[in-house]
């Protein structure tokens, strides 16, 4: 970090490596909860037009797919992988792809994925074997 850039008081926000260059935050789809038409598919696009800069450099991209008697929703956000989301640990937070894993929730079907590549939560994958042929 050049001397004229003040050292941050908040070490969570000011992350740097040994070379002194400041670590960038991730860019993720961030539409919160939206109604979705994604159902019974091996993969889906988020159809979220908002790509946000995550608030902190260690946050990753997250997608949450939920289906109940009334509707299907897809949630896209940034989140700290050290913290739970909807009560669940973010698995595979270092993955370049957002591969959905089912979570046990009463009254709904609930899938969640996390990933750490730009806009990786724009393309959500429900089928593990599909990951090899998915676009970069």
């Amino acid at each position: 970090i050049p001397p004229h850039v003040p050292k941050s008081v908040n070490s969570d926000v000011m992350a740097s490596d040994n070379g002194g260059a400041v670590k960038l935050p991730q860019l993720c789809k961030f539409c919160d909860v939206r109604l979705s038409t994604c159902d019974n598919q091996k993969s889906c696009m988020s159809n979220c037009s908002i790509t946000a800069i995550c608030e902190k450099p260690h946050e990753v991209c997250v997608a949450v797919w939920r289906k109940n008697d009334k509707n299907i929703t897809l949630e896209t956000v940034c989140h700290d992988p050290k913290l739970t989301y909807h009560g669940f640990t973010l698995e595979d937070a270092a993955s370049p792809k957002c591969v959905m894993k089912e979570k046990k929730r009463a009254g709904e079907t609930f899938f969640m994925c996390a990933c750490n590549m730009e806009e990786c939560n724009d393309y959500i994958i429900f089928s593990e074997e599909y990951t090899t042929s998915s676009p970069d």
Partner: nanobody, 124 residues
Framework: EVQLLESGGGLVQPGGSLRLSCAAS???????RMWWVRQAPGKGLEWVS?????????YYARSVDGRFTISRDNSKNTLYLQMNSLRAEDTAVYYC?????????????????WGQGTLVTVSS
Amino acid sequence: EVQLLESGGGLVQPGGSLRLSCAASGFTFTEYRMWWVRQAPGKGLEWVSAIEPIGNRTYYARSVDGRFTISRDNSKNTLYLQMNSLRAEDTAVYYCAKQMPGQKWMAKSRFDYWGQGTLVTVSS
């Protein structure tokens, strides 16, 4: 030598507007994603906005989305930040920064050059 020189900061009333500029030299401007980053007094860095080198695709922090507009003029090697509907919480030193080339992995993404910064004060 890489240089980034910001200008356009100053004192503005809440609800007012400012346009920041960042003149870049010493590297091929059209090859790099550029960022505006700010640091409020006593706070950490906040990544405000970014713009792709070609095609002008833009990204914003949720705190400024809809109020700030990033742009660039590749013919002038200049980066801009139009700030509207300014609030007291926008008070900060604003830096432009050049992203290092590399993969799209967070673990490998870094800034390697910064400007000196320009102070924006929003107060009545």
